[in-house]
Amino acid sequence: ELCDDDPPEIPHATFKAMAYKEGTMLNCECKRGFRRIKSGSLYMLCTGNSSHSSWDNQCQCTSSATRNTTKQVTPQPEEQKERKTTEMQSPMQPVDQASLPGHCREPPPWENEATERIYHFVVGQMVYYQCVQGYRALHRGPAESVCKMTHGKTRWTQPQLICTGEMETSQFPGEEKPQASPEGRPESETSCLVTTTDFQIQTEMAATMETSIFTTEYQ
């Protein structure tokens, strides 16, 4: 089941999935001046079986000036430099597929890809938040959000993160010790069935991950 909305927006913070549940879709978007090739897919889809997950379809962009062709366009040097910058900002593959069954890793960039990625998440997806550079994390609880099914509708849990304007970069998942607070999980979900999966394994995985998993471009 696809989630109705994007994850919640937190002021001065970005979110990132460490792995993508099967069923997740990623739009094939191209940078300005380029378009998806005519025979190409509109999306990539995370699919798989019990032992292996991967992205179906490949995104391909071509120059807008050459409609109806499948020719791949070699980026100019300045475009190659721009893409390299993006890759350096996101140096790690978020998760080894073998460590999290039923999930795909971050797809590698494709040539002339747009600088923003739009994912269509599915129920059970977890994303993690980090304050942007120049802001410091204050935690009241987990800096994460999960797409849940409640009463037949999907919704994202509210991450318990505040980013303050102190000129100090926070480390993921935050150098502040989370406060023991009754509002750490504000939603009361005992009254009906909630569909959740893989939360425990993802949380455990998150604790072992590197800190530099965010880019401001792929929000």
């Epitope: 696809l2 109705d4 994007d6 978007e29 509109l42 923003e116 739009i118």
Partner: nanobody
């Protein structure tokens, strides 16, 4: 509550152009793909075109050379520019919004529909 309201339909002569609009309200449509279908009496709804938030498009081969979809995110509005209209383009045109592009081609999977706008092409 999500609402999709189409406008711009009407009667035109063969060879003329028409631009349909679909104004969306009731939620954020950032992670939705939006597009157009049409239906003639007694037939199934036919997929025409879809567009993502960032402007990626997918068109049915039958209309790709004559119809162009576009999107104004600031107005939450999607457009369908229809050129060189033919009598066989006569139909009710529906705006649609769906959470995922994979399911979009099948009308049975679409999450939200507009009420439709009639387009008639005849001399």
């Amino acid at each position: 509550q999500v609402q999709l309201v189409e406008s711009g339909g009407g009667w035109v002569q063969p060879g003329d152009s028409l631009r349909l609009s679909c104004a969306a309200s009731g939620r954020s449509f950032r992670n939705y793909v939006m597009g157009w279908f049409r239906q003639v009496p007694g037939k199934e709804r036919e997929f025409l075109s879809v567009i993502t938030w960032l402007g990626g498009t997918l068109d049915a081969d039958s209309v790709a050379d004559r119809f162009t979809i576009s999107r104004d995110n600031s107005k939450n509005t999607v457009y369908l520019q229809m050129d060189s209209l033919k009598p066989e383009d006569t139909a009710v045109y529906y705006c649609a919004a769906d959470r995922g592009p994979a399911r979009y081609i099948s009308a049975s999977d679409v999450d939200y529909w507009g009420q439709g706008t009639q387009v008639t092409v005849s001399s």
